[in-house]
Interface confidence: low
């Protein structure tokens, strides 16, 4: 099984024990590590951070001790913006220039492939996204002709039904991608006005959401029905939780909220907590399991957080094995307890290790 793990370059800026550099990563933990994110400037793939080249080097030296490790560079992301991607993909010349710039950039910096993180193609971009993937793959095949190992091509896709329907021609893009990471998290957010888990495995009878689509199981099943081969589908598992501020004394699933939860000490983003911050939060909190959804949430005072723990990730891995998927994807290594100092287990990357162990179990 693949264990595809994202590392985010901006995690270096978190203060104190939250700061994570690629040299803190475990070279034997994941089969693939994806560095997020690269930029595109003047239609050419480019660095984003001032010290990306140094960090690329840090990451790719992990392969010196584990030659089986594959590294990919992810281009795009939330801050890049869908419109910028759209302009490049929809213009034949811009697209060609971008595609041509990728292999030499990846080879120069020691990457094994490219991950496309266009978040998200609009309805009118659907065909252009397919063309971009098809032409990128053709370029990778051509570039590898002189006996080089062919560069890998992957894409991170939304797990939301509405986005899947409008953005992706699943059957076509699947033909050209080496694997697809389905982002089976962020199903539920503060916009709903109630508490709810952002990454439930199943819908569960407890789900207060108005649709049956906001769960991992539906998204995976839907992708398969649309023609994604199970052998290329990698299921996303978050090492972060989504938090809410409760608006009343109700604390269950579907309880009213006044907004996102208070920012974490290190991640400093309202409504989001890294797993290592959740371990801190759990001291003195009340933990519940949403039985049908097979995921936990915890409450403390007026704060509510839905997250994944070692038990829930094992359930998710068993599910992806039953579905015969290609493996698991983790967002993100730097949100797990990468130092092993927060979650009291004397173990670095406890969630990702639990995923790895479950994938290896017979």
């Amino acid at each position: 099984y693949k264990l595809v793990c994202y590392y985010t370059s901006w995690s270096q800026y978190r203060e104190g024990d939250g700061s994570c550099f690629p040299d803190a990563l475990d070279r034997f933990l994941c089969t693939h590590i994806i560095y997020s994110f690269a930029n595109i400037s003047n239609d050419h793939i480019d660095t984003w951070e001032w010290n990306d080249v140094t960090l690329y080097g840090m990451l790719n030296t992990l392969k010196n001790r584990n030659p089986n490790l594959k590294t990919l560079l992810s281009v795009g992301g939330w801050n890049f913006g869908s419109q910028r991607f759209s302009k490049i993909a929809s213009n034949t010349q811009s697209r060609r220039t971008f595609i041509k710039s990728v292999p030499p950039f990846l080879r120069t910096h020691g990457f094994d492939g490219l991950d496309l993180a266009w978040l998200y193609p609009g309805r009118r971009d659907k065909q252009h996204f397919t063309t971009l993937i098809k032409e990128m793959k053709a370029e990778f095949i051509k570039e590898a002709q002189p006996g080089k190992k062919q560069l890998l091509l992957s894409a991170a896709l939304s797990a939301g039904k509405v986005t899947i329907d409008s953005s992706y021609d699943i059957a076509k893009i699947s033909q050209h991608l080496d694997f697809i990471s389905i982002m089976t998290y962020d199903f539920h957010g503060a916009w709903r006005g109630t508490t709810g888990h952002h990454s439930p495995l199943f819908r569960g009878q407890e789900d207060a959401s108005p649709d049956r689509f906001s769960n991992t199981d539906y998204a995976v099943g839907y992708m398969l029905r649309l023609g994604a081969p199970a052998s290329k589908l990698v299921m996303g598992i978050p090492t972060f939780g989504r938090s809410f501020t409760l608006a009343s004394s109700e604390t269950g699933v579907g309880a009213p909220i006044s907004g996102p939860g208070i920012p974490g000490r290190f991640t400093k983003e309202a409504g989001t907590l890294a797993y290592y911050e959740i371990c801190d939060f759990l001291r003195g909190a009340t933990v519940h399991r949403i039985l049908g959804q097979q995921v936990p949430y915890a409450t403390k005072g007026n704060q509510w957080v839905g997250y994944d723990d070692q038990e829930s990730v094992k359930s998710k891995v068993q599910y992806l094995k039953d579905r015969q998927l290609a493996g698991a994807m983790v967002w993100a290594l730097d949100l797990d307890d990468f130092q092993g100092s927060f979650c009291g287990q004397d173990l670095r990357f406890p969630l990702t290790n639990a995923i790895k162990d479950a994938l290896a179990a017979t």
Epitope: K161, F202, R203, G204, Q205, P210, D211, R212, F213, D217, Y218, G221, L224, R225, L226, G227, A230, G292, Y319, D322, R323, Q324
Partner: antibody, heavy 125, light 110 residues
């Protein structure tokens, strides 16, 4: 009691049309289920025709043999599922069953938990 | 499309016999295989879902096993009411349901 009752079967000429109904009781036809039609030609095995998600979405799936000729729909207030059949052929002669998937989770894949008693459609001149 | 092949198409057995019916999928379907029993003039009845889970009210003499492409339905001790036709059905994908059912196995009295 949760049950499904089909009706509308009968004799129809080749090229003709027919609409079968499946009345649901004990649960609402706008709840979280897939409803499917399965048929069985005389002395033959079971053949899946198609399914519709009866909740808030509009998922429908059809077997290639009936695609473009058969349409599955629902009427929430009547709590009824329909199978509209057009351009009927002799090989469409069968007992038509209405069946319900098990509901809220795909944890076990899908399976048909609840079946109607069936209604016979005969296509002959 | 996922093709389901059932064997044998018919078998003769006596009350008390152990009966085994097999079902093969043309491609891997994980654990998503269901079994139904049908008696003449009646609708099919769910026996086993997800390869090995017994449906509600089904006697424990019925059991299922298998994963991937090869599956088995076993009746440990055949009873008079078990003489019927048995069908397997893949529960992996609605898209590949052409046709999702096996051809059936008729269990007759020897």
């Amino acid at each position: 009691e949760v049950q499904l009752v089909e009706s509308g079967g009968g004799l129809v000429q080749p090229g003709g049309s027919l609409r079968l109904s499946c009345a649901a009781s004990g649960f609402t036809i706008s709840s979280d289920y897939y409803m499917c039609w399965v048929r069985q030609a005389p002395g033959k095995g079971l053949e899946w025709i198609g399914c519709i998600y009866i909740g808030s979405g509009t998922d429908t799936y059809y077997a290639d043999s009936v695609k473009g000729r058969f349409t599955i729909s629902k009427h929430n207030s009547k709590n009824t599922l329909y199978l509209q059949m057009t351009s009927l052929r002799a090989e469409d002669t069968a007992v038509y069953y209405c069946a319900r998937d098990k509901g809220w989770s795909n944890a076990w894949g899908f399976y048909f938990q609840l079946w109607g008693q069936g209604t016979l459609v005969t296509v002959s001149s | 499309d996922i093709q389901m092949t059932q064997s044998p198409s018919s078998l003769s057995a006596s009350v008390g016999d152990r009966v085994t019916i097999t079902c093969q999928a043309s491609q891997s379907i994980g654990k998503y295989l269901n079994w139904y029993q049908q008696k003449p003039g009646k609708a099919p009845k769910l026996l086993i879902y997800s390869s090995s889970s017994l449906a509600s009210g089904v006697p424990s003499r019925f059991s299922g096993s298998g994963f991937g492409t090869d599956f088995t339905l076993t009746i440990s001790s055949l009873q008079p009411e078990d003489f019927a036709t048995y069908y397997c059905q893949q529960g992996y994908s609605y898209v590949d349901l052409e046709n999702g059912f096996g051809g059936g196995t008729k269990v007759e009295i020897k």
